[in-house]
Interface confidence: low
């Protein structure tokens, strides 16, 4: 089948990194600079993405693959393939139309991006608050008072749980 297809369509022989050049009797021409073709049999090459402004180049464009962008420090990627860069905020804040704002009481954000989320309501699970929440950390729920053994007068609270990659402030 491949052999038949090649006889019928000479473009099918053009590998990635080239395009089938109709102006030159359908020979395979290399993609011009700043363009690429990631699959064989292409009749055109695609223009490379340019990482400008708040975007920076994570991977250079090659003749067979597009450039990949990420964001300059202080910004993070949003959207498929980092189509947008959004400003970072501090932990304990969220980004609003007016800039970074502290989380309201009863909410927290333990990342530099995203929105403030409500503290966990321990009582919904019949548990008590072991460690109070902050703007940066959720509450830590402990066993309900009824679960404590009669001799246990206090419970040593564990250190607040931290997500991997987040160092203490």
């Amino acid at each position: 089948f491949e052999r038949t297809r090649s006889l019928q369509d000479p473009c099918s022989n053009c590998p990635a990194g080239t395009f089938c050049d109709n102006n030159r009797n359908q020979i395979c021409s290399p993609c011009p600079p700043n363009s690429f073709s990631s699959a064989g049999g292409q009749r055109t090459c695609d223009i490379c993405r340019q990482c400008k402004g708040v975007f920076r180049t994570r991977k250079e464009c090659s003749s067979t693959s597009n450039a990949e962008c990420d964001c300059t420090p202080g910004f993070h990627c949003l959207g498929a393939g980092c189509s947008m860069c959004e400003q970072d905020c501090k932990q304990g804040q969220e980004l609003t139309k007016k800039g970074c704002k502290d989380c309201c009481f009863g909410t927290f954000n333990d990342q530099k991006r995203g929105i403030c989320r409500p503290w966990t309501n321990c009582s919904l699970d019949g548990k008590s608050v072991l460690v109070n929440g902050t703007k940066e950390r959720d509450v830590v729920c402990g066993p309900s008072p009824a679960d404590l053994s009669p001799g246990a007068s206090s419970v040593t609270p564990p250190a607040p749980a931290r997500e991997p990659g987040h160092s203490p402030q």
């Epitope: 050049d21 030159r24 011009p32 363009s35």
Partner: nanobody
Framework: EVQLLESGGGEVQPGGSLRLSCAAS????????MAWFRQAPGKEREFIGR????????DYVESVKGRFTISRDNPKNTLYLQMSSLRAEDTAVYYC???????????????????WGQGTLVTVKP
């Protein structure tokens, strides 16, 4: 034989406009990126702007952005440079150039281009 021939230069007053043309022959014009450069007396050749082979992307030097526009007509094998709001410092010989298929150099450097026209003189003076 690859040939590039610029035309359309001349004398113009500050604030005026000119349209330069670059006629290509001897090769598949539509397969290559094209650029305009200029060279003022006693200065190095300066990149003005480049248009990708399929007009999919354009790059301009900061000093001409908003004033100069590059376009191309692939069926006519012709590259254009529309210049407006011309200033005295735009006085130079203007060259068109064909972009290499492969180059290690940045698109703004002359080494990225393998064929050049003979140039057309643009003079801006009151």
């Amino acid at each position: 034989e690859v040939q590039l021939l610029e035309s359309g230069g001349g004398e113009v007053q500050p604030g005026g406009s000119l349209r330069l043309s670059c006629a290509a022959s001897g090769w598949a014009f539509g397969n290559y990126g094209m650029a305009w450069f200029r060279q003022a007396p006693g200065k190095e050749r300066e990149f003005i702007g480049r248009l990708a082979w399929n007009a999919g992307s354009t790059d301009y030097v900061e000093s001409v952005k908003g004033r100069f526009t590059i376009s191309r007509d692939n069926p006519k094998n012709t590259l254009y440079l529309q210049m407006s709001s011309l200033r005295a410092e735009d006085t130079a010989v203007y060259y068109c150039a064909r972009q290499r298929s492969y180059s290690r150099y940045d698109i703004r450097t002359p080494q990225t281009y393998d064929y050049w026209g003979q140039g057309t003189l643009v003079t801006v003076k009151p």
